[in-house]
Each structure stands twice: as C-alpha cells, then as structure tokens.
C-alpha cells in the first residue's frame, strides 16, 4: 500500500504534455516537479489526464503558465505530502500566474512538511479562503497568496453540502470565525483531531501510527501509512534506518549495494553534474562534507587531516577552462589529475569567479596552458597553486605556456606566492601587458631557471606595451576626515615630461590589510578598485619648487578602512619602452562620526512604575559605539481615553486576517473600509510612512520572486532531450 | 485475547512516590498510543497522560505535569506512570488503556486502587 | 480546555424505552468524540468513537450523532444490561477531556 509505483527523479515539463506521461508510474518523485510554460494546451487536453498513484514530491511543486489547466483534482487526485527538502525559493508549493486555473483541487494534500506556500497572480483562483493551511504546514505565516481572484471577493466558494443547506465539510477557526474547510464543491479539506498531529487519520479521524505522515488506510499500523514521516524500508514506516541501511534523500532506506551503484553509475559516465555518492553518518549522500574525504575501498567519508584534498581526474586528461560555468566543475578540487587549459575571453565578475572554482587547486599533474585569455589580467585567482609536476608537458616539452594573452599583467604576486614546477619549461609569447621581470621573477620562484632555450620566452612580445621600468611613488602628505581623505604624492617626470598624461588613483574598502592590485580585476570591467583619473601638475623649470600632485576624496564611509595606491598613466614610446612608476598599497582609516539612529526601538511597561526600552545598534556606527543616550519626557494623557465608552458596538477586536504578511493593495481597501463610519461620513486614514514602506518592501521582494523564477525557469533549449533519469538527484 | 493488567498502587502519604506498571498482551504493544486514566472515588473520568508508539511524544493533564512521568518499555509490553509528590486529590483508581488511534480507548484494564493519605 | 457538558445527569428509564442523552463541547470539536458505558466496580466500555461509528461486538440498538459542538448518544431499546454510567470524551485536543456523566438507573 505504501508507494505503490515507482521512485521517479525530479522533472521539469515544459512546452507541451507530452513528457507528462513520464509521471504515470510514480509513487514518489525524488526532487522537484515542475509543470511550466504550456501555451498551447487547452482545458480538453487534460481531461483524461490523472495520476493516481503519485503521492509524494520530496522538494518541490511549482505550475507556472500551464493554459487550459482548470484544477488539480484529477491530475493528482492522491498527492498527500510534499516534503520541501529543497525549496523554491523558501517555498513548497508555487502556483504563479496560472491564467486558467479556477481551483487548486488536492483534497489529498495533508503536508507540506518545510517551507511554504505561494499563490499569486492566478486571474481565476478561487477557492482559497476555504483552505486552513494551517492543518497542512507549520509556517502559515509565510505563506504569500494575493493577487488571486479570490483577493477580490468575486469567488463564490460552495462546499460539498451547502447548496442543499447542509454543512458536509469540517470547519475549522480563523480569526474568530468557523469556516468550511474544501478544496472544490465536491471535496471537503480532509481535517484530523489536532491531537494526531501531521500524522493523518482514518475517515473517522483515528490517529495514524506516529511514524506515518498525512494519512493511513488503517490506524496504529506502521505498514499502513500513505507516507512516512522519517523513513520509508521495505513496505513499513520506520524512525531511523537500522543496519546495514543507510538513509537516502531524507526519506527511505538504501543499502551499501544501491549507493555503490549510484557511486560507480556517476564515475562511469560523462555526464556532467552527477554525484559520485558516499555514505557518511549512516546516510547515502552525494558529497563528503567539508573537513571530510572518501575512502574510496568502502565509500566512507573520513576525517581529512589538514586541508582536504579532492583529487579531480580530467577526461581525456585534459580540461578547457572558457567559461565561468566550466571552471565550476571543478568548484573543490585540490588536485587536478591531468591538464589545464585556461581560454577566457569574456564574462562577468570574472576573478571572483574563477577564484570561487578554481582558488582550491594546489597541484596539476601535467601542463598549465593560458592561451587567448583576453579577459584575464592576473593569475591570482590560481590562490593556492603551489606545484605543476609536469607529468604530461605540451608540445615542445612545456610545463607552463602563455600565449596571446592582451591583457596578462601579473602572474602572482611573487612576494606572497611560492610555485614549484618539478618538470618541463617556461613558455611565454605575445602577452604584450605583461613585464619580462615577471616573467624572470616566476624562472626563479619556479626552479626553472636555466631550461628554456633561447625562444622560449620572446624578448620583444612580452611586456610590449607595458610601464615596466616601474620607479616607486612616494606618498608626501596624508589627511582624513570623516568622508575625505587628502593625498599627495612626490612628483614623477619620465625623461619627455610630455609623456606623462597623468595618474591613476585606485582605491577601495579594505577591511584587512591584505590587497593586491590585482585582486578582482578582469579585462571586461569588472574591478574591484575605484579608479580616479588625475591630470599632471604644472610642471615647474626648478626641480626644488616642484608641484606635488593629490587629491582629495570625498564621499567616502566614516572610520572605514582604504587601500590605495597611485600609479602614473604615460604614452606609448617608439623606442618600444614605456617608463612609468607606481605606489605601493597603503591603508588609510577615515575619522569616526555621529552614528546613525538606533534601530527598532521597542518599548513595553512591565509595571506601573517602568517601562522597558530596547534597541538594535544602528546600521552605521561611524565609529566604536561607547555607549547610548535615551531621552524621555512625561506627556499628557489623552483625555479620549477616559471618555470612550469601550461597551460601543463599532469598535471591533483587532484580528489577524488569514492572508500573509504582506498583503494585496485591493485587501488593503477593503481592511479599510471595515473600519469606516457606516453613515459614510469618515475618510480612509492616508497612508503612514510604515505602510509605505511596508508596500515598498513587498514590491521589491515580489520582484525578487518573479527575478528568481525567470531566472531558473527560463534555460536555453538543450540539443539533447536527455532526461537524465539515471541521476537520483532532481533534474 | 488483549489483556491489560494494572499494579503498583497502594497508600503513599502526600508528597510520597508510586510507580504504576502495566503489563500488556495479546496484541501488537510498540503499533498503540498508551494512555492512563483516573476516578476518584465517586466521580468522574479523568484522563491523566498518554504516549506514543515509540515513547517520544507524550502529553499530561496540567494537574500532574511536572509530578507525573509516563514511560514504556516495547520490550517488556510494559506501560508505567511514575507519581512523584502525590497530593490527597490524586487518590483514584488508575486505569491504563490501550488508545486506538490514539485517543478511542478500546482495551482497559481492571485498574489499582492509589490512596494518598497521612 | 475543553468543557464536555452531559445532560441530564442522571435519569430514570424502563426497558424496552428510548433513550438519548446528550452531550455538549465548549468548542467545535468536528466529530472527534467517543461514548463509553461503565458499570460499579468496572472499566469503562468504548461503544462509540467518531460521534457516529460503533465499537465492532457493541449491539446495534446504541447509535451516536451530531458534529461541532452538540452530540447525542441514543439507546433505541433499552435492554436490563445497559443500565450504566455514560460519559462522553472529546478527542479533538489536549488535554483530552470527559464529560460528568450520565447516571441511567431502572425506573
């Protein structure tokens, strides 16, 4: 009885029905269901649709313009629990901008077991307010169900039993009130005795066995449930997984053989994004834990000492590196089994990226390559690169080969950066930005000093177009404010004063004094560094009496710490040498000031005689906070208070209405009309400034839905229709 | 045949202890929610506690929480209520009952007497 | 709490007689109730759970109604063996709660 059909892996249907009828065996889907994007389909189509024997979603269920789509009720008749191990964006159940759908109709809904609930933007909805959610999760309060057409009081909601002037269906409270509880005019909402908790009930509400979840076809038996709270073995509910089982995707039990299966199924195949599964506190999950590495004789995640490694073996024996999304495959590996070639011409957030995927390596057993990496200005994103072995060298018997790379400036900085390269050689052409004295630095950090040969590193393609007979910048005089800081710095001429045609001055917020120049830098814009350009003083004939350039910044954060440095900006020479010269990084602080206003001031009396005040420390300090000021002055009563007759009938007991907390513009309108004079003489309050804000605030985060939803629901077509139902895990 | 059998009770002096047991058998013990149920002489029912299946849920009228710790051991089929600072008003017949579905108790037992008394 | 308020608290029948008595909860309690019969000196009996259903071996001249808040008991035939006390019990919540009792006695 319990999970008749099949484990399904999470689905996305899309465009047309036709994948649809992958669901027809499934009992459980292990992941996510998404019905999306169906433009064409008709409320026809799905007559004869239904999937009886699906009963559990394990993450989530998310319906996103599916046309034609009037109810749910014959589609999953039987869907009792969704279990939101992974969420959608905090919620279990989306339903969102279903133009047709007039009803939800899952009168078998009994759990959604994490997250919750949003409905919105469903022109024909109704049926809403019949719903208790509060018998089906926990977080009703973070439920967001507006703009429905049950928003606008246009729904005539029937239960079963009304039209003949019967009540059929349980009623529960809300705000005071008993309400029917129904999914359709034909389905009441199934309600349990509070005591059975979300365990389900019979039909005549007798408790399920506490290890059942939402339902059971029988009371008291653990092999009678619909699904199970805490794990699924062999046709019974059960708390834990006994041995030799182990827990699987938080609700049934494997053994060793089906998680080795899933293990050697992975790391066999080519496809990308699988996990190669492990056991690790008694359960079956994809990864080992951060601190932890595999065993790979028995699966088993042991306890790294030191830093873990996570050796990553290359198809092929090589990987290309072109984007941010294929460095991400390589998101964790410590050691690289195999080749790198880096080929980056363009992208987004460029070196915080890489170093995010790729800033974990510390070993290549063959070859580094950075080839027409266009976008790429440092190798520091390489942050904890410490040996290429050079097992398998590139053609010409290289090790590390640099070729073409137009904005190439620093490979890393060799101060704080030490490299072995055990074999091969050192190749470097046509990195017109980046200095031979790099590169010379690298043959001796590296050990390879003394094997190249002679055009292996080309004098006149490297450092071409660079300032690299850089002099050090001195700063002369340094001042702060609060929001400024005034700067100078000794005078610099290259021997044609006339090339100079200014400074750069770079600076940025920096917490800990530990800045590079080079730090998220890429050649497509994306800096981390503020960058002010500085026009050359006048230049004076009498060295002694010379200008000192600066510059004052303003605008800046109080008592916040700033890198800067500045460096000179100088032309291009024939005799294909540039001077220039540069600053090192300096920290400087801003002066403290007044601190912003204490946050969410509270108060409460806790007697005749106190009142208790609380506050959060304000979102800008401006400085070390020593202490706070709290002012207060008696104040006159309000002699209202005395002469109100609280016996009058119109006043009304503040209630908490049933829908989310952020609520509808048009059930707004309505909350305020309650409260006006009958006889129509009083005007709607205007708006304060917290309910402005409170509406701002859920405009800004229904665009932070809808941003998230589009995100992850609109993907370029795929050339293959895999549908990868080998992979456990969700699609 | 499912039997329920009651023991334990006796006269304790207020503030006293008692431990209540119950043997169960003739059905599946670890599948039920288990309760205790009281009557003071000439009055009344009063629920007094129950447990679930595996002995993690358990729930208490207000008048006994705190002095009134139910247990069971699957093991033994065995239920016990375990009454620590007894009172005058905790003198009753203590009947356990096997709670189908939790809470339709369809199997009792014949109840022990408690009297708390100086 | 729940309040369970029975009616009356006692009365006098004759076998072979009709019988209802009632029942009241201070809340809605759908129809989570159950009904038991104890006899001097026994345990209670189950004879209705769900306000409607009936305990398998109970005779069928005991029937049980009504939702919310108002349940009756019915003896339909009162036969020499079910004079007893009654008592109702809401289950819808904790703590669960019963009602004073309903004495029936021989007329």
């Known amino acids: 009885h319990l999970y008749p059909g099949e484990v399904c892996p999470g689905m996305d249907i899309r465009n047309n029905l036709t994948r649809l009828h992958e669901l027809e065996n499934c009992s459980v889907i292990e992941g996510h269901l998404q019905i999306l994007l169906m433009f064409k389909t008709r409320p026809e189509d799905f007559r004869d649709l239904s999937f009886p024997k699906l009963i559990m979603i394990t993450d989530y269920l998310l319906l996103f313009r599916v046309y034609g789509l009037e109810s749910l009720k014959d589609l999953f008749p039987n869907l009792t629990v969704i279990r939101g191990s992974r969420l959608f964006f905090n919620y279990a159940l989306v339903i969102f901008e279903m133009v047709h759908l007039k009803e939800l109709g899952l009168y078998n809904l009994m759990n959604i077991t994490r997250g919750s609930v949003r409905i919105e933007k469903n022109n024909e909805l109704c049926y809403l307010a019949t719903i208790d959610w509060s018998r089906i999760l926990d977080s009703v309060e973070d439920n967001y169900i507006v703009l429905n057409k049950d928003d606008n009081e246009e729904c005539g909601d029937i239960c079963p039993g009304t039209a003949k002037g019967k009540t059929n269906c349980p009623a529960t409270v809300i705000n005071g009130q008993f309400v029917e509880r129904c999914w359709t005019h034909s389905h009441c909402q199934k309600v349990c005795p509070t005591i059975c908790k979300s365990h389900g009930c019979t039909a005549e509400g007798l408790c399920c066995h506490s290890e059942c979840l939402g339902n059971c076809s029988q009371p008291d038996d653990p092999t009678k449930c619909v699904a199970c709270r805490n794990f699924y073995l062999d046709g019974r509910c059960v708390e834990t997984c006994p041995p030799p089982y182990y827990h699987f995707q938080d609700w049934r039990c494997v053994n060793f053989s089906f998680c080795q299966d899933l293990h050697h199924k992975c790391k066999n195949s080519r496809r990308q994004g699988c996990h190669q599964y492990v056991i690790h506190n008694n359960k079956c999950i994809p990864e080992c834990p951060s601190g932890y590495t595999m065993n790979s004789s028995n699966l088993l995640c042991t306890p790294c000492l030191g830093p873990c490694p996570k050796v990553c073996h290359l198809l092929e024996g090589e990987k290309t590196i072109d984007s941010v999304t294929s460095a991400q495959e390589l998101r964790g590996c410590t050691v690289i089994n195999g080749s790198l070639i880096i080929n980056i011409r363009g992208g987004n957030n460029l070196a915080a990226e890489l170093e995010a995927n790729l800033g974990l390596i510390e070993e290549i057993s063959g070859y580094l390559k950075i080839r027409r990496s266009y976008a790429l200005v440092s190798l520091s994103f390489f942050r904890k690169l410490r040996l290429i072995r050079g097992e398998t060298l590139e053609i010409g018997n290289y090790s590390f080969y640099a070729l073409d790379n137009q904005n190439l400036r620093q490979l890393w900085d060799w101060s704080k950066h030490n490299l072995t390269i055990t074999q091969g050689k050192l190749f470097f052409h046509y990195n017109p930005k980046l200095c031979l004295s790099e590169i010379h630095k690298m043959e001796e950090v590296s050990g390879t000093k003394g094997r190249q040969e002679r055009n292996d590193i080309a004098l006149k393609t490297n450092g071409d177009q660079a300032s690299c007979e850089n002099e050090l910048l001195k700063f002369s005089y340094i001042r702060t404010s609060f929001d400024k800081i005034l700067l100078r710095w000794e005078p610099y001429w290259p021997p044609d004063f006339r090339d100079l045609l200014g400074f750069m001055l770079f600076y940025k917020e920096a917490p800990y004094q530990n800045v590079t120049e080079f730090d998220g830098q890429d050649a497509c814009g994306s800096n981390s560094w503020t960058v002010v350009d500085i026009d050359p003083p006048l230049r004076s004939n009498d060295p002694k009496s010379q200008n000192h350039p600066g510059w004052l910044m303003r605008g800046l954060k109080p008592w916040t710490q700033y890198a800067i440095f500045v460096k000179t900006l100088v032309t291009f020479s024939d005799e294909r040498r540039t001077y220039g010269a540069k600053s090192d990084i300096i920290y400087v602080q801003t002066d403290a000031t007044n601190p912003s206003v204490p946050l969410d001031p509270i108060s409460v009396s806790n007697s005749s005689s106190q009142i208790i005040l609380k506050w959060k420390p304000p979102s800008d300090p401006n400085g070390n906070i020593t202490h706070y000021l709290v002012f207060w002055e008696r104040q006159a009563e309000d002699s209202e208070l005395f002469e109100l007759d609280y016996c009058l009938k119109g006043l009304k007991l503040p209630s908490r209405t049933w829908s989310p907390p952020f609520e509808s513009e048009d059930s707004q309108k309505h909350n305020q009309s309650e409260y006006e004079d009958s006889a129509g003489e009083c005007c709607s309050c205007p708006k304060t400034d917290s309910q402005i804000l409170k509406e701002l605030e859920e405009s800004s985060f229904r665009k932070t839905f809808e941003d998230y939803l589009h995100n992850v629901v609109f993907v370029p077509r795929k050339t293959s229709s895999g549908t990868g139902a080998e992979d456990p895990r969700p699609s | 045949e499912v039997q329920l059998v009651e023991s334990g009770g006796g006269v304790v002096q207020p503030g006293g202890s008692l431990r209540l047991s119950c043997a169960a058998s003739?059905?599946?013990?670890?599948?039920?929610?288990m309760t205790w149920v009281r009557q003071a002489p000439g009055k009344g029912l009063e629920w007094v506690a129950n447990?679930?299946?595996?002995?993690?849920?358990?729930h208490y009228v207000d008048s006994v929480k705190g002095r009134f710790t139910i247990s069971r051991d699957n093991a033994k089929n065995s239920l016990y209520l375990q009454m620590n600072s007894l009172r005058g008003e905790d003198t009753a017949v203590y009947y356990c009952?096997?709670?189908?579905?939790?809470?339709?108790?369809?199997?009792w037992g014949q109840g022990t007497l408690v009297t708390v008394s100086s | 709490d729940i309040q369970m308020t029975q009616s009356p608290s006692s009365l006098s029948a004759s076998v072979g007689d009709r019988v209802t008595i009632t029942c009241r909860a201070s809340q809605g309690i759908s129809s989570w109730l159950a009904w038991y019969q104890q006899k001097p000196g026994k345990a209670p009996k189950l004879l209705i759970y769900?306000?409607?259903s009936l305990q398998s071996g109970v005779p069928s001249r005991f029937s049980g109604s009504g939702s919310g808040t108002d349940f009756t008991l019915t003896i339909s035939s009162l036969q020499p063996e079910d004079f007893a006390t009654y008592y109702c019990q809401q289950a819808n919540s904790f703590p669960i709660t019963f009602g004073q009792g309903t004495r029936l006695e021989i007329k």
């Open positions: 447990i679930n299946q595996d002995g993690s849920e358990k």
């Open positions: 003739g059905f599946t013990f670890s599948s039920y929610w």
């Open positions: 769900a306000a409607s």
């Open positions: 009952a096997r709670g189908r579905g939790a809470w339709a108790f369809d199997y």
